[in-house]
Structure formats: structure tokens, C-alpha cells
């Protein structure tokens, strides 16, 4: 079943390569287990950036080597992606799945365009 997911259209990452945004889903029921996946679309290719499954009321747990961290509050997931470089500029799509209890719901946002600017190199000093 389909579910609405909202996320900002455009975000500029910080000069340290960190971008945070909220992914909000309109939960039709009382889900206890939710899976959040961040997909990156660039030049027509879609790749998975990170994913986490969490129990409502608990923290999101990404893999140890993940570039993502996140917190949840109700139907909102606050996602942070770090270690971004200019080459990582692209459309980051939030996919939310309500895993349990049934029925299963799937929602995919329109994506957040994350622009990443590599810091200017410092001029050499004498």
C-alpha cells in the first residue's frame, strides 16, 4: 500500500560536508517497526546510501561504517549524512517502509537535492 512521504526539495550541505533533513511520513496505522532507506539519484542512476530499521520510540541504528545517522520522533525521521564531497551532489530520496504489524506500507519521497560545495583551498602563506 502507498504512503505519502515529505522531505525538503533543496538543501545545501555545510562546509564540513554534513547535510541534515527531515523525512516525514503520513502513517496510516500504528506501525511498531519502520525501515528507512536513503537512495541517491544522479545521472539517472539510483544507489542505496544507507538504511536502518527501528522500533517506534527507539533510536535508528545504521551500520557502523554508514555515513548516515538519524533520530526519530513520531512520524518524522531526522536524517544526517556526513562526509559529503562536491561529487556527492545529487537527489537524495527518502524511502519509508512500515514493516510491522501488517499491512505493509511503502512511501517514497520526491527527493532532496543536496548541493555539496568543496571548501576553497586556503591560499599559501609565506
Amino acid at each position: 500500500k502507498a504512503m505519502h512521504v515529505a522531505q525538503p526539495a533543496v538543501v545545501l550541505a555545510s562546509s564540513r560536508g554534513i547535510a541534515s533533513f527531515v523525512c516525514e511520513y503520513a502513517s496510516p496505522g500504528k506501525a511498531t517497526e519502520v525501515r528507512v532507506t536513503v537512495l541517491r539519484q544522479a545521472d539517472s542512476q539510483v544507489t542505496e546510501v544507507c538504511a536502518a530499521t527501528y522500533m517506534m520510540g527507539n533510536e535508528l541504528t545504521f551500520l557502523d561504517d554508514s555515513i548516515c545517522t538519524g533520530t526519530s520522533s513520531g512520524n518524522q525521521v531526522n536524517l544526517t549524512i556526513q562526509g559529503l564531497r562536491a561529487m556527492d551532489t545529487g537527489l537524495y530520496i527518502c524511502k519509508v517502509e512500515l514493516m510491522y504489524p501488517p499491512p505493509y506500507y511503502l512511501g517514497i519521497g520526491n527527493g532532496t537535492q543536496i548541493y555539496v560545495i568543496d571548501p576553497e583551498p586556503c591560499p599559501d602563506s609565506d
Epitope: A9, L12, A13, S14, S15, A86, T89, Q113, Y115, I117
Partner: antibody
Framework: QVQLVQSGAEVKKPGASVKVSCKAS????????ISWVRQAPGQGLEWMGW????????NYAQKLQGRVTMTTDTSTSTAYMELRSLRSDDTAVYYC??????????WGQGSLVTVSS | EIVLTQSPGTLSLSPGERATLSCRAS???????LAWYQQKPGQAPRLLIY???SRATGIPDRFSGSGSGTDFTLTISRLEPEDFAVYYC?????????FGQGTKVEIK
């Protein structure tokens, strides 16, 4: 409909500052960015920089760094561009534009800033 | 900085003719981040094409964009009287975002 309405024309003396406003309507202001572009009389378009309204992060053109500041007031859905230490070659029409995933649309109607002693 | 060079500087054509405008980048540009704008005297620019080839809302299908890498083209299949204007390309691929110097399409 989505609209950006800018403040009126200004005449400034060299060395002074100017602050141009851009009021947005018809969309969720915090979801997009606002870019500023200027056009000197009879010349082409020059990108000045932009602000990510969602988090307030900014990216300025190198040549204006230190003289330009872009801010927003989310309570009134208004973006501002302040340019300091004005020179005669800053005389231009200043445009704001909504930044989407890979476009500027729409644009404000433009604000003429004249720098003259 | 990515420099965009537009050619020709001026294009003199008659209504009904085909216009081909070129935009060449000094470095490779992701086609996702190349746009075209139209500007008429005394007016703000208007988005025509984004992502190198996608028409903006309300833009007639006589306008089309193509290209990749360093070479991009805006084509107007049959010029209408209202199409005589200045056209700019712009890249968002790398900061600073830059515009071409513009191509003026004038009535012959």
C-alpha cells in the same frame, strides 16, 4: 501561484550598503533555496550566490565574498541580500530566484540599484 | 570555475526559421545541472530547459535542449515573433554556478 516580489529601486553613494528584499508566496518557503543574480546595464547575468532556506547555509561567488550577506526570515517568507562597500560597478538590476533541484524558477521582477556620487 | 561559452553571439533569423544555439563548457558538466533561460528587454529571465533536455512547465514544444559533457544545444524548431530575445545557458554542476554570456536572437 509561485511568486517572488522584490523591493523597489535604490540609489546609493559609493561606500554605502544596500539591502534588497524578496518576498516569496505560493510554495513552502523553507523547502527551497533562494539565489541572487545581478545584471549590469547592457550586460549578461552574473551569479552572486544562494542561500539554502531550510538550514541557512550559504554559498557566495568568490569575488563578492566578504561584501555580500544573504539571509532569510522564514516567518515572513522573505529573503534578503545585503551588499556592502558599494562601488559604481555594482550598479545593476538584482534578481532573486527560487532554487529547485536543478533550476532557477521563478525569478523576481528585479530591483535596480544605482551607485552614484 | 567552469566557463560557459555561447555561440553565436547574435543570430539573425526570420520568423518560421530554425534556431540552433550552442553552449560549450570549459570542463565537463553533468547534464542534470545544465539549464537554459530566455530574457526579453526589461524583463526577468524565464526558465526554458532544465536538466539539459527537460522543458519547464508551460514552455512550448518548439523549444528543445540536448547535449552532454561539454557541448549543449538549445533548438527552437520554428521561430515565433515572441521568441526573439536573449538566451542564456547556466551550469549548476560545480560551484561557482555560472552563466554563458548569452546569444541574442534577432529578427533578420
Amino acid at each position: 501561484q509561485v511568486q517572488l516580489v522584490q523591493s523597489g529601486a535604490e540609489v546609493k553613494k559609493p561606500g554605502a550598503s544596500v539591502k534588497v528584499s524578496c518576498k516569496a508566496s505560493g510554495y513552502t518557503f523553507t523547502s527551497y533555496g533562494i539565489s541572487w543574480v545581478r545584471q549590469a546595464p547592457g550586460q549578461g547575468l552574473e551569479w552572486m550566490g544562494w542561500i539554502s532556506v531550510y538550514n541557512g547555509n550559504t554559498n557566495y561567488a568568490q569575488k563578492l565574498q566578504g561584501r555580500v550577506t544573504m539571509t532569510t526570515d522564514t516567518s515572513t517568507s522573505t529573503a534578503y541580500m545585503e551588499l556592502r562597500s558599494l562601488r559604481s560597478d555594482d550598479t545593476a538590476v538584482y534578481y532573486c530566484a527560487r532554487v529547485g533541484a536543478n533550476w532557477f524558477d521563478p525569478w523576481g521582477q528585479g530591483s535596480l540599484v544605482t551607485v552614484s556620487s | 570555475e567552469i566557463v560557459l561559452t555561447q555561440s553565436p553571439g547574435t543570430l539573425s533569423l526570420s520568423p518560421g526559421e530554425r534556431a540552433t544555439l550552442s553552449c560549450r563548457a570549459s570542463q565537463s558538466v553533468s547534464s542534470s545541472y545544465l539549464a537554459w533561460y530566455q530574457q526579453k528587454p526589461g524583463q526577468a529571465p524565464r526558465l526554458l530547459i532544465y536538466g539539459a533536455s527537460s522543458r519547464a512547465t508551460g514552455i512550448p514544444d518548439r523549444f528543445s535542449g540536448s547535449g552532454s559533457g561539454t557541448d549543449f544545444t538549445l533548438t527552437i524548431s520554428r521561430l515565433e515573433p515572441e521568441d526573439f530575445a536573449v538566451y542564456y545557458c547556466q551550469q549548476y554542476s560545480r560551484s561557482p554556478w555560472t552563466f554563458g554570456q548569452g546569444t541574442k536572437v534577432e529578427i533578420k
